[in-house]
């Protein structure tokens, strides 16, 4: 399996009750506006064929996409949670900037691309869905990267 380097986050990032609560509240607010319950972004298909040691790199890719293509464009919605959660997630993204995989990451990019395609295909409702799954993103990052 490809070797991942610098794919680590300190546990303390996920032990801040206030921002954890705000992240979960933001996800819940968005999920209430999500009418498409047939599609799951962060689930079995995303992790398929990705070993445990590669998952932090996988989640870094998902985090970066979520920030750039979803949260920044939707930053005026779901206040006041959005204005607190986005900088927190951006800091995590910055801390993972040196997280790379040495070797072939095509299988990971394929899974991430499917997630991206799903969000794009659903349009704005795809973006809402991605925000509604921020709790899953948070917990997946936590388990994959600490």
């Amino acid at each position: 399996a490809p070797i991942s380097s610098h794919c680590r986050l300190d546990k303390s990032n996920f032990q801040q009750p206030y921002i954890t609560n705000r992240t979960f509240m933001l996800a819940k607010e968005a999920s209430l506006a999500d009418n498409n319950t047939d599609v799951r972004l962060i689930g079995e298909k995303l992790f398929h064929g990705v070993s445990m040691s590669e998952r932090c790199y996988l989640m870094k890719q998902v985090l970066n996409f979520t920030l750039e293509e979803v949260l920044f464009p939707q930053s005026d919605r779901f206040q006041p949670y959005m204005q607190e959660v986005v900088p927190f997630l951006a800091r995590l993204s910055n801390r993972l900037s040196t997280c790379h995989i040495e070797g072939d990451d095509l299988h990971i990019q394929r899974n991430v691309q499917k997630l991206k395609d799903t969000v794009k295909k659903l349009g704005e409702s795809g973006e809402i869905k991605a925000i509604g799954e921020l709790d899953l993103l948070f917990m997946s990052l936590r388990n994959a990267c600490i």
């Epitope: 609560n21 509240m25 819940k28 992790f47 990705v50 070993s51 445990m52 040691s53 917990m139």
Partner: antibody, heavy 119, light 108 residues
Framework: EVQLVQSGAEVKKPGASVKVSCQAS????????IHWVRQTPGQGFEWMGW????????RYAQKFQGWVTMTRDMSNTTAYMELPGLRDDDTAVYYC????????????WGQGTLVTVSS | QSVLTQPPSVSVAPGKTATITCGGN??????VHWYQQRPGQAPVLVIY???DRPSGIPERFSGSRSGNTATLTISRVEAGDEADFYC???????????FGGGTKLTVL
């Protein structure tokens, strides 16, 4: 077919130790966390912790930290849960369960191992 | 003492609809899973993430959420549905899954 097959029932005296095994088949062992959950008539279900088969890393519930030990053997795709210093109230059915992400969506469970602690 | 509250028992006639609830404080932002446990058997996941159904679980099983209460609904109940049902959720603050005390479903 995904299967988790656990070791048989155990009867132990207070203060003794028990080691329960959980053999996985039908999927890639290293791709799923193995959790241990126990069930008692009084307390219901109680999460004990998980082992990451790929790395051997563990996460334990606070109650079991420094007490339980969870390990795995990749060569025979088996996870183990060892609990020393047994007390009467550790009498329970102990389950292993697999989960993809490391939190709480258990898509497959072992059949359970009854551990009875009695003098 | 369970953090998630479920009614101890629910009774329903065959062919009717059974509703099992699960509630808890500060629970509204967390996702809920439901497990079915028949006597002497291991639990089986029947609903995850509030309303998703794993493959192989009949469409008669559905889940929903409203505020601090999650609901498992079983329509056209059959005798084989008789079991204990448990809700669970992940608490990111204590970093562990929590379980309800269970509801015994009796098919009359």
């Amino acid at each position: 077919e995904v299967q988790l097959v656990q070791s048989g029932a155990e009867v132990k005296k207070p203060g003794a130790s028990v080691k329960v095994s959980c053999q996985a088949s039908g999927y890639t062992f290293s791709d799923y966390y193995i959790h241990w959950v126990r069930q008692t008539p009084g307390q219901g279900f109680e999460w004990m912790g998980w082992v990451n088969p790929d790395t051997g890393g563990t996460r334990y519930a606070q109650k079991f930290q420094g007490w339980v030990t969870m390990t795995r053997d990749m060569s025979n795709t088996t996870a183990y849960m060892e609990l020393p210093g047994l007390r009467d109230d550790d009498t329970a059915v102990y389950y292993c369960a697999r989960d993809l992400t490391g939190y709480d969506q258990y898509t497959a469970w072992g059949q359970g191992t009854l551990v009875t602690v009695s003098s | 003492q369970s953090v998630l509250t479920q009614p101890p028992s629910v009774s329903v006639a065959p062919g009717k609809t059974a509703t099992i609830t699960c509630g808890g404080n500060n629970f509204r932002n967390k996702r809920v899973h439901w497990y079915q446990q028949r006597p002497g058997q291991a639990p089986v996941l029947v609903i995850y993430y509030d309303s998703d159904r794993p493959s192989g679980i009949p469409e008669r099983f559905s889940g929903s959420r409203s505020g601090n209460t999650a609901t498992l609904t079983i329509s056209r109940v059959e005798a084989g549905d008789e079991a204990d049902f448990y809700c669970s959720t992940f608490d990111p603050f204590t970093d562990r899954p929590l379980f309800g005390g269970g509801t015994k479903l009796t098919v009359l």
